[in-house]
Protein backbone atom coordinates (compact mmCIF):
# COMPACT_ATOMS: atom_id res chain seq x y z
CA UNK A 1 0.00 0.00 0.00
CA UNK A 2 1.09 3.53 -0.82
CA UNK A 3 1.67 6.24 2.26
CA UNK A 4 -1.00 8.09 1.18
CA UNK A 5 -3.31 5.00 0.99
CA UNK A 6 -2.50 3.39 4.64
CA UNK A 7 -3.30 7.52 5.65
CA UNK A 8 -6.74 7.45 4.19
CA UNK A 9 -7.44 4.25 5.49
CA UNK A 10 -6.12 5.08 8.86
CA UNK A 11 -8.49 8.32 8.32
CA UNK A 12 -11.47 6.19 7.22
CA UNK A 13 -11.28 3.56 10.53
CA UNK A 14 -11.05 6.44 13.30
CA UNK A 15 -14.15 6.98 14.75
CA UNK A 16 -13.59 11.02 15.23
CA UNK A 17 -13.88 10.86 11.59
CA UNK A 18 -17.29 9.08 11.81
CA UNK A 19 -18.13 11.49 14.18
CA UNK A 20 -17.10 14.76 12.11
CA UNK A 21 -19.65 13.33 9.31
CA UNK A 22 -22.78 12.69 11.49
CA UNK A 23 -21.71 16.07 12.72
CA UNK A 24 -21.48 18.26 9.86
CA UNK A 25 -24.51 16.21 8.01
CA UNK A 26 -26.83 17.32 11.07
CA UNK A 27 -25.51 20.98 11.16
CA UNK A 28 -26.37 20.62 7.03
CA UNK A 29 -29.75 19.62 8.16
CA UNK A 30 -30.09 22.67 10.50
CA UNK A 31 -28.76 24.73 7.59
CA UNK A 32 -31.49 23.90 5.17
CA UNK A 33 -34.25 24.45 7.57
CA UNK A 34 -33.39 27.97 7.60
CA UNK A 35 -36.16 30.12 5.93
CA UNK A 36 -34.53 33.04 4.89
CA UNK A 37 -30.65 31.91 5.29
CA UNK A 38 -28.31 35.34 5.58
CA UNK A 39 -25.07 35.49 2.91
CA UNK A 40 -22.57 34.13 5.10
CA UNK A 41 -24.16 30.68 4.93
CA UNK A 42 -23.00 30.45 1.08
CA UNK A 43 -19.74 30.03 2.84
CA UNK A 44 -20.80 27.39 5.48
CA UNK A 45 -22.28 25.67 2.30
CA UNK A 46 -19.02 25.50 0.66
CA UNK A 47 -17.66 24.02 4.06
CA UNK A 48 -20.28 21.65 4.08
CA UNK A 49 -19.45 19.99 -0.25
CA UNK A 50 -15.88 20.26 0.95
CA UNK A 51 -16.03 17.79 4.08
CA UNK A 52 -18.23 15.63 1.91
CA UNK A 53 -16.28 15.69 -1.30
CA UNK A 54 -12.86 15.03 1.45
CA UNK A 55 -14.83 12.18 2.99
CA UNK A 56 -15.47 10.84 -0.07
CA UNK A 57 -11.76 11.12 -1.53
CA UNK A 58 -10.71 9.27 1.74
CA UNK A 59 -12.73 6.48 0.95
CA UNK A 60 -11.51 6.34 -2.48
CA UNK A 61 -8.02 6.20 -2.11
CA UNK A 62 -8.93 3.64 0.99
CA UNK A 63 -11.12 1.47 -1.44
CA UNK A 64 -10.24 2.11 -4.70
CA UNK A 65 -13.19 3.67 -7.07
CA UNK A 66 -14.79 0.81 -8.96
CA UNK A 67 -12.43 -1.64 -9.87
CA UNK A 68 -12.60 -4.41 -7.70
CA UNK A 69 -14.89 -6.04 -5.08
CA UNK A 70 -15.02 -4.08 -2.03
CA UNK A 71 -14.38 -0.46 -3.76
CA UNK A 72 -16.43 2.39 -3.38
CA UNK A 73 -18.96 2.83 -5.80
CA UNK A 74 -19.71 -1.02 -5.54
CA UNK A 75 -21.15 0.30 -1.96
CA UNK A 76 -24.81 1.66 -2.74
CA UNK A 77 -24.66 3.62 -0.09
CA UNK A 78 -21.83 5.57 -1.33
CA UNK A 79 -23.72 6.02 -4.57
CA UNK A 80 -25.73 8.38 -2.52
CA UNK A 81 -22.70 10.14 -1.01
CA UNK A 82 -21.50 10.39 -4.90
CA UNK A 83 -24.89 11.49 -6.27
CA UNK A 84 -25.05 14.24 -3.03
CA UNK A 85 -21.24 15.85 -4.01
CA UNK A 86 -22.11 15.78 -7.68
CA UNK A 87 -25.56 18.15 -7.28
CA UNK A 88 -23.26 20.37 -5.14
CA UNK A 89 -21.06 21.14 -7.77
CA UNK A 90 -23.51 21.19 -10.76
CA UNK A 91 -25.55 23.57 -8.90
CA UNK A 92 -22.37 25.88 -8.08
CA UNK A 93 -21.04 25.88 -11.18
CA UNK A 94 -23.10 24.78 -14.07
CA UNK A 95 -26.12 27.30 -15.02
CA UNK A 96 -28.66 24.71 -15.57
CA UNK A 97 -31.79 27.58 -15.69
CA UNK A 98 -34.16 26.46 -13.05
CA UNK A 99 -31.62 25.93 -10.56
CA UNK A 100 -34.45 24.86 -7.73
CA UNK A 101 -35.35 22.48 -9.07
CA UNK A 102 -31.59 21.03 -8.85
CA UNK A 103 -31.54 22.45 -4.83
CA UNK A 104 -34.27 19.77 -4.04
CA UNK A 105 -31.65 17.68 -4.46
CA UNK A 106 -30.12 18.95 -1.39
CA UNK A 107 -32.19 17.44 0.69
CA UNK A 108 -30.18 14.08 -0.05
CA UNK A 109 -27.85 15.30 2.25
CA UNK A 110 -30.35 13.82 5.07
CA UNK A 111 -30.60 10.94 3.82
CA UNK A 112 -26.44 10.88 4.45
CA UNK A 113 -27.38 9.94 8.08
CA UNK A 114 -28.40 6.69 7.30
CA UNK A 115 -25.26 5.35 6.10
CA UNK A 116 -23.69 6.34 8.96
CA UNK A 117 -25.87 5.44 11.82
CA UNK A 118 -25.50 1.68 12.22
CA UNK A 119 -29.05 0.80 13.82
CA UNK A 120 -30.54 2.99 10.77
CA UNK A 121 -28.83 1.05 7.84
CA UNK A 122 -30.06 -2.40 9.39
CA UNK A 123 -33.96 -0.74 9.41
CA UNK A 124 -33.31 0.69 6.14
CA UNK A 125 -32.29 -2.71 5.01
CA UNK A 126 -34.79 -4.44 6.28
CA UNK A 127 -37.09 -2.27 4.13
CA UNK A 128 -35.40 -2.87 1.66
CA UNK A 129 -35.87 -6.45 1.94
CA UNK A 130 -39.43 -6.13 2.65
CA UNK A 131 -40.00 -4.45 -0.48
CA UNK A 132 -38.86 -6.96 -2.29
CA UNK A 133 -40.29 -9.90 -0.29
CA UNK A 134 -43.90 -7.30 -0.81
CA UNK A 135 -43.95 -7.63 -4.80
CA UNK A 136 -46.03 -10.65 -5.25
CA UNK A 137 -48.20 -9.54 -2.09
CA UNK A 138 -48.53 -6.21 -4.13
CA UNK A 139 -49.52 -8.33 -7.33
CA UNK A 140 -51.94 -10.08 -5.52
CA UNK A 141 -53.17 -6.35 -4.11
CA UNK A 142 -53.32 -4.67 -7.67
CA UNK A 143 -55.12 -7.98 -9.05
CA UNK A 144 -57.71 -7.96 -6.41
CA UNK A 145 -58.61 -4.47 -6.58
CA UNK A 146 -58.53 -4.65 -10.28
CA UNK A 147 -60.97 -6.95 -10.17
CA UNK A 148 -63.40 -5.31 -7.69
CA UNK A 149 -63.03 -2.07 -9.76
CA UNK A 150 -64.14 -3.50 -12.87
CA UNK A 151 -67.23 -4.95 -10.60
CA UNK A 152 -67.46 -1.70 -9.27
CA UNK A 153 -67.25 -0.24 -12.70
CA UNK A 154 -70.56 -2.19 -14.27
CA UNK A 155 -72.53 -1.92 -11.07
CA UNK A 156 -72.11 2.01 -10.24
CA UNK A 157 -71.38 3.83 -13.39
CA UNK A 158 -72.88 6.90 -14.02
CA UNK A 159 -74.56 6.37 -10.63
CA UNK A 160 -72.92 9.15 -8.31
CA UNK A 161 -74.72 11.48 -10.87
CA UNK A 162 -77.84 11.14 -9.44
CA UNK A 163 -79.30 14.03 -8.29
CA UNK A 164 -82.68 15.68 -6.35
CA UNK A 165 -83.22 18.41 -9.38
CA UNK A 166 -86.36 21.21 -8.73
CA UNK A 167 -89.14 19.99 -10.44
CA UNK A 168 -91.09 23.37 -10.34
CA UNK A 169 -89.15 25.32 -13.37
CA UNK A 170 -90.17 28.59 -15.14
CA UNK A 171 -92.19 27.93 -17.71
CA UNK A 172 -89.50 28.31 -20.48
CA UNK A 173 -86.63 26.50 -18.60
CA UNK A 174 -85.68 23.16 -19.59
CA UNK A 175 -82.98 20.88 -17.98
CA UNK A 176 -80.57 21.50 -20.83
CA UNK A 177 -81.40 25.30 -20.27
CA UNK A 178 -80.37 25.52 -16.96
CA UNK A 179 -76.79 23.34 -16.93
CA UNK A 180 -76.23 25.45 -20.09
CA UNK A 181 -76.08 28.82 -17.79
CA UNK A 182 -75.15 27.55 -14.25
CA UNK A 183 -72.08 28.81 -13.48
CA UNK A 184 -71.84 29.57 -9.65
CA UNK A 185 -72.18 27.11 -6.61
CA UNK A 186 -75.38 29.67 -5.52
CA UNK A 187 -76.90 29.00 -9.29
CA UNK A 188 -76.75 24.75 -8.29
CA UNK A 189 -78.18 25.37 -5.04
CA UNK A 190 -81.29 27.25 -6.64
CA UNK A 191 -82.37 23.65 -9.14
CA UNK A 192 -80.83 21.20 -6.93
CA UNK A 193 -81.85 19.87 -3.31
CA UNK A 194 -78.57 20.19 -0.91
CA UNK A 195 -78.82 18.74 2.42
CA UNK A 196 -77.85 21.89 5.25
CA UNK A 197 -74.05 21.94 5.18
CA UNK A 198 -73.40 19.63 2.36
CA UNK A 199 -70.69 21.35 -0.57
CA UNK A 200 -73.09 18.16 -2.90
CA UNK A 201 -76.31 17.77 -4.38
CA UNK A 202 -78.31 15.30 -2.69
CA UNK A 203 -77.82 12.15 -4.22
CA UNK A 204 -80.81 9.69 -5.51
CA UNK A 205 -81.74 6.42 -7.14
CA UNK A 206 -83.87 4.83 -9.26
CA UNK A 207 -84.61 1.62 -7.90
CA UNK A 208 -86.74 1.05 -5.22
CA UNK A 209 -84.14 0.68 -2.37
CA UNK A 210 -82.32 3.64 -3.41
CA UNK A 211 -82.34 7.17 -1.73
CA UNK A 212 -85.70 9.05 -2.78
CA UNK A 213 -85.89 12.79 -3.50
CA UNK A 214 -87.84 15.29 -1.15
CA UNK A 215 -91.00 16.77 -2.38
CA UNK A 216 -90.50 19.17 -5.03
CA UNK A 217 -87.59 17.60 -6.76
CA UNK A 218 -87.18 14.52 -9.70
CA UNK A 219 -84.17 12.77 -9.55
CA UNK A 220 -81.97 12.89 -12.75
CA UNK A 221 -78.40 12.04 -14.12
CA UNK A 222 -77.02 14.99 -14.54
CA UNK A 223 -73.73 17.33 -14.03
CA UNK A 224 -70.73 16.06 -12.19
CA UNK A 225 -69.83 13.58 -9.65
CA UNK A 226 -69.67 14.06 -5.86
CA UNK A 227 -66.48 15.64 -4.15
CA UNK A 228 -65.47 18.01 -6.76
CA UNK A 229 -66.05 15.16 -9.62
CA UNK A 230 -62.88 12.97 -7.90
CA UNK A 231 -65.72 10.26 -5.92
CA UNK A 232 -66.89 7.79 -8.99
CA UNK A 233 -67.23 4.75 -10.86
CA UNK A 234 -67.36 6.07 -14.42
CA UNK A 235 -64.12 4.65 -15.42
CA UNK A 236 -61.67 2.24 -14.66
CA UNK A 237 -59.04 4.27 -12.87
CA UNK A 238 -61.56 5.90 -10.91
CA UNK A 239 -63.01 3.12 -9.87
CA UNK A 240 -59.86 1.39 -8.81
CA UNK A 241 -59.23 4.57 -6.67
CA UNK A 242 -62.48 4.69 -4.81
CA UNK A 243 -61.68 0.63 -3.99
CA UNK A 244 -57.94 1.65 -3.17
CA UNK A 245 -59.99 4.04 -0.80
CA UNK A 246 -62.06 0.99 1.00
CA UNK A 247 -58.92 -0.89 0.90
CA UNK A 248 -57.10 1.57 3.12
CA UNK A 249 -60.57 2.36 4.64
CA UNK A 250 -59.58 6.56 4.17
CA UNK A 251 -63.40 8.26 4.81
CA UNK A 252 -64.86 5.41 2.96
CA UNK A 253 -68.07 5.04 5.18
CA UNK A 254 -69.05 8.54 3.28
CA UNK A 255 -68.27 6.64 -0.16
CA UNK A 256 -70.37 3.48 1.19
CA UNK A 257 -73.23 5.71 1.79
CA UNK A 258 -73.24 7.49 -0.93
CA UNK A 259 -72.62 4.49 -2.97
CA UNK A 260 -75.71 2.86 -1.49
CA UNK A 261 -78.07 5.66 -1.92
CA UNK A 262 -77.44 6.30 -5.56
CA UNK A 263 -77.70 2.61 -6.41
CA UNK A 264 -78.97 1.15 -3.53
CA UNK A 265 -78.84 -0.72 -0.33
CA UNK A 266 -78.32 -4.20 -2.08
CA UNK A 267 -75.25 -3.11 -2.79
CA UNK A 268 -74.19 -3.49 0.84
CA UNK A 269 -72.86 -6.94 0.12
CA UNK A 270 -70.40 -5.60 -2.02
CA UNK A 271 -68.81 -3.22 0.43
CA UNK A 272 -68.69 -6.16 2.69
CA UNK A 273 -67.18 -8.23 0.57
CA UNK A 274 -63.98 -4.98 -0.45
CA UNK A 275 -63.81 -4.36 3.32
CA UNK A 276 -63.31 -8.07 4.36
CA UNK A 277 -61.23 -9.29 1.78
CA UNK A 278 -59.12 -6.08 1.11
CA UNK A 279 -59.00 -3.71 4.08
CA UNK A 280 -58.84 -6.70 6.31
CA UNK A 281 -57.41 -9.29 4.82
CA UNK A 282 -55.02 -7.77 2.04
CA UNK A 283 -53.45 -4.99 4.49
CA UNK A 284 -52.86 -7.90 7.20
CA UNK A 285 -51.09 -10.02 4.82
CA UNK A 286 -48.64 -6.81 3.92
CA UNK A 287 -48.11 -6.13 7.73
CA UNK A 288 -46.74 -10.45 8.13
CA UNK A 289 -45.07 -10.03 5.10
CA UNK A 290 -42.70 -6.81 6.97
CA UNK A 291 -42.85 -8.38 9.93
CA UNK A 292 -41.28 -11.46 8.29
CA UNK A 293 -38.64 -9.09 6.50
CA UNK A 294 -37.57 -7.71 9.30
CA UNK A 295 -37.33 -10.83 11.06
CA UNK A 296 -35.33 -12.45 9.17
CA UNK A 297 -32.85 -9.12 8.77
CA UNK A 298 -32.33 -9.41 12.17
CA UNK A 299 -31.34 -13.04 12.59
CA UNK B 1 -85.02 5.90 -27.43
CA UNK B 2 -87.63 7.81 -25.47
CA UNK B 3 -90.98 8.83 -27.67
CA UNK B 4 -93.61 11.11 -26.80
CA UNK B 5 -96.66 10.98 -28.51
CA UNK B 6 -99.52 13.28 -28.27
CA UNK B 7 -102.89 12.14 -29.15
CA UNK B 8 -106.90 13.47 -28.87
CA UNK B 9 -106.65 17.02 -30.90
CA UNK B 10 -108.97 17.84 -33.55
CA UNK B 11 -111.69 20.45 -34.89
CA UNK B 12 -113.95 21.78 -31.88
CA UNK B 13 -116.84 24.45 -31.38
CA UNK B 14 -116.08 27.06 -29.20
CA UNK B 15 -117.51 26.28 -25.76
CA UNK B 16 -116.41 22.74 -26.25
CA UNK B 17 -114.01 20.51 -24.67
CA UNK B 18 -111.22 18.12 -25.56
CA UNK B 19 -108.67 16.23 -24.02
CA UNK B 20 -105.54 15.58 -25.12
CA UNK B 21 -102.58 12.76 -23.96
CA UNK B 22 -99.14 12.51 -24.29
CA UNK B 23 -97.83 8.80 -23.48
CA UNK B 24 -94.12 8.59 -23.08
CA UNK B 25 -92.64 5.37 -24.12
CA UNK B 26 -88.87 3.74 -24.01
CA UNK B 27 -87.22 2.35 -20.68
CA UNK B 28 -88.37 4.83 -18.50
CA UNK B 29 -86.65 4.92 -15.30
CA UNK B 30 -88.31 8.15 -14.20
CA UNK B 31 -90.67 11.19 -15.06
CA UNK B 32 -90.17 14.42 -13.58
CA UNK B 33 -92.50 17.22 -15.05
CA UNK B 34 -94.32 16.99 -17.96
CA UNK B 35 -95.95 20.12 -19.77
CA UNK B 36 -98.04 21.66 -22.20
CA UNK B 37 -97.33 24.22 -24.41
CA UNK B 38 -99.17 25.20 -28.05
CA UNK B 39 -97.82 27.29 -30.65
CA UNK B 40 -100.84 29.22 -32.84
CA UNK B 41 -100.10 30.11 -36.40
CA UNK B 42 -97.69 32.95 -36.87
CA UNK B 43 -96.53 32.95 -33.23
CA UNK B 44 -93.97 31.81 -30.69
CA UNK B 45 -94.78 29.18 -28.51
CA UNK B 46 -96.37 29.23 -25.73
CA UNK B 47 -96.44 27.31 -22.20
CA UNK B 48 -99.49 26.19 -21.26
CA UNK B 49 -99.73 23.72 -18.09
CA UNK B 50 -96.99 21.43 -15.96
CA UNK B 51 -97.20 18.71 -13.61
CA UNK B 52 -94.42 17.38 -11.73
CA UNK B 53 -93.99 13.95 -10.55
CA UNK B 54 -95.70 14.61 -7.27
CA UNK B 55 -98.84 16.07 -9.26
CA UNK B 56 -98.03 19.73 -8.15
CA UNK B 57 -99.30 21.64 -10.98
CA UNK B 58 -99.15 24.92 -12.60
CA UNK B 59 -100.87 27.06 -15.33
CA UNK B 60 -100.99 29.86 -17.65
CA UNK B 61 -102.92 32.58 -16.59
CA UNK B 62 -104.86 32.73 -20.10
CA UNK B 63 -106.14 28.96 -19.76
CA UNK B 64 -106.81 28.81 -15.43
CA UNK B 65 -109.62 27.35 -14.65
CA UNK B 66 -110.72 26.34 -18.46
CA UNK B 67 -107.78 23.62 -18.87
CA UNK B 68 -106.92 20.92 -16.52
CA UNK B 69 -103.69 18.59 -16.39
CA UNK B 70 -103.05 15.08 -14.67
CA UNK B 71 -101.26 12.56 -15.37
CA UNK B 72 -101.01 8.14 -15.00
CA UNK B 73 -97.34 7.71 -13.64
CA UNK B 74 -98.03 3.55 -14.21
CA UNK B 75 -98.72 4.67 -17.85
CA UNK B 76 -96.41 7.72 -18.10
CA UNK B 77 -98.95 9.49 -19.90
CA UNK B 78 -100.14 13.50 -19.29
CA UNK B 79 -103.67 14.25 -19.91
CA UNK B 80 -104.86 18.20 -20.93
CA UNK B 81 -108.86 18.38 -20.11
CA UNK B 82 -109.71 21.50 -22.06
CA UNK B 83 -112.71 23.19 -21.48
CA UNK B 84 -114.93 26.34 -22.87
CA UNK B 85 -112.25 26.07 -25.92
CA UNK B 86 -112.19 29.62 -27.45
CA UNK B 87 -111.05 30.48 -31.33
CA UNK B 88 -107.94 31.86 -29.95
CA UNK B 89 -106.97 28.42 -28.72
CA UNK B 90 -106.99 26.87 -31.96
CA UNK B 91 -102.54 26.35 -31.76
CA UNK B 92 -100.36 22.83 -32.25
CA UNK B 93 -100.09 21.17 -28.75
CA UNK B 94 -97.11 20.30 -27.93
CA UNK B 95 -95.81 18.14 -24.94
CA UNK B 96 -92.74 18.05 -23.12
CA UNK B 97 -91.31 15.84 -20.56
CA UNK B 98 -88.13 15.48 -18.63
CA UNK B 99 -87.19 11.83 -18.78
CA UNK B 100 -84.62 9.59 -17.34
CA UNK B 101 -84.34 6.64 -18.96
CA UNK B 102 -82.07 3.46 -19.55
CA UNK B 103 -80.12 4.19 -22.98
CA UNK B 104 -78.19 1.85 -25.47
CA UNK B 105 -75.44 0.48 -23.58
CA UNK B 106 -77.43 -0.09 -20.43
CA UNK B 107 -76.36 3.28 -19.42
CA UNK B 108 -78.92 6.02 -17.86
CA UNK B 109 -79.38 9.43 -19.32
CA UNK B 110 -81.84 12.34 -18.02
CA UNK B 111 -83.00 15.21 -20.70
CA UNK B 112 -86.16 16.98 -22.35
CA UNK B 113 -87.74 15.41 -24.53
CA UNK B 114 -90.51 16.87 -27.21
CA UNK B 115 -93.87 15.20 -28.67
CA UNK B 116 -94.72 16.05 -32.32
CA UNK B 117 -97.78 17.92 -31.76
CA UNK B 118 -101.31 17.72 -32.00
CA UNK B 119 -103.67 20.37 -34.10
CA UNK B 120 -106.60 21.50 -32.15
CA UNK B 121 -108.46 23.74 -34.04
CA UNK B 122 -111.31 26.11 -32.36
CA UNK B 123 -114.23 27.19 -35.10
CA UNK B 124 -117.87 27.67 -35.65
Known amino acids: FSPLRRISIKILVHSLFSMLIMCTILTNCIFMTMNNPPDWTKNVEYTFTGIYTFESLVKILARGFCVGEFTFLRDPWNWLDFVVIVFAYLTEFVNLGNVSALRTFRVLRALKTISVIPGLKTIVGALIQSVKKLSDVMILTVFCLSVFALIGLQLFMGNLKHKCFRNSLENNETLESIMNTLESEEDFRKYFYYLEGSKDALLCGFSTDSGQCPEGYTCVKIGRNPDYGYTSFDTFSWAFLALFRLMTQDYWENLYQQTLRAAGKTYMIFFVVVIFLGSFYLINLILAVVAMAYEEQNQ | EVQLVESGGGVVQPGGSLRLSCAAS????????MRWHRQAPGKQREFVAR???????GYADSVKGRFTISRDNAKNTVYLQMNSLRPEDTALYYC??????????????????WGQGTLVTVSS
Open chain 2, 51 to 57: ITDDSAT
Open chain 2, 26 to 33: GRILRIGY
Open chain 2, 96 to 113: EALVTASVRGGSIHSGTY
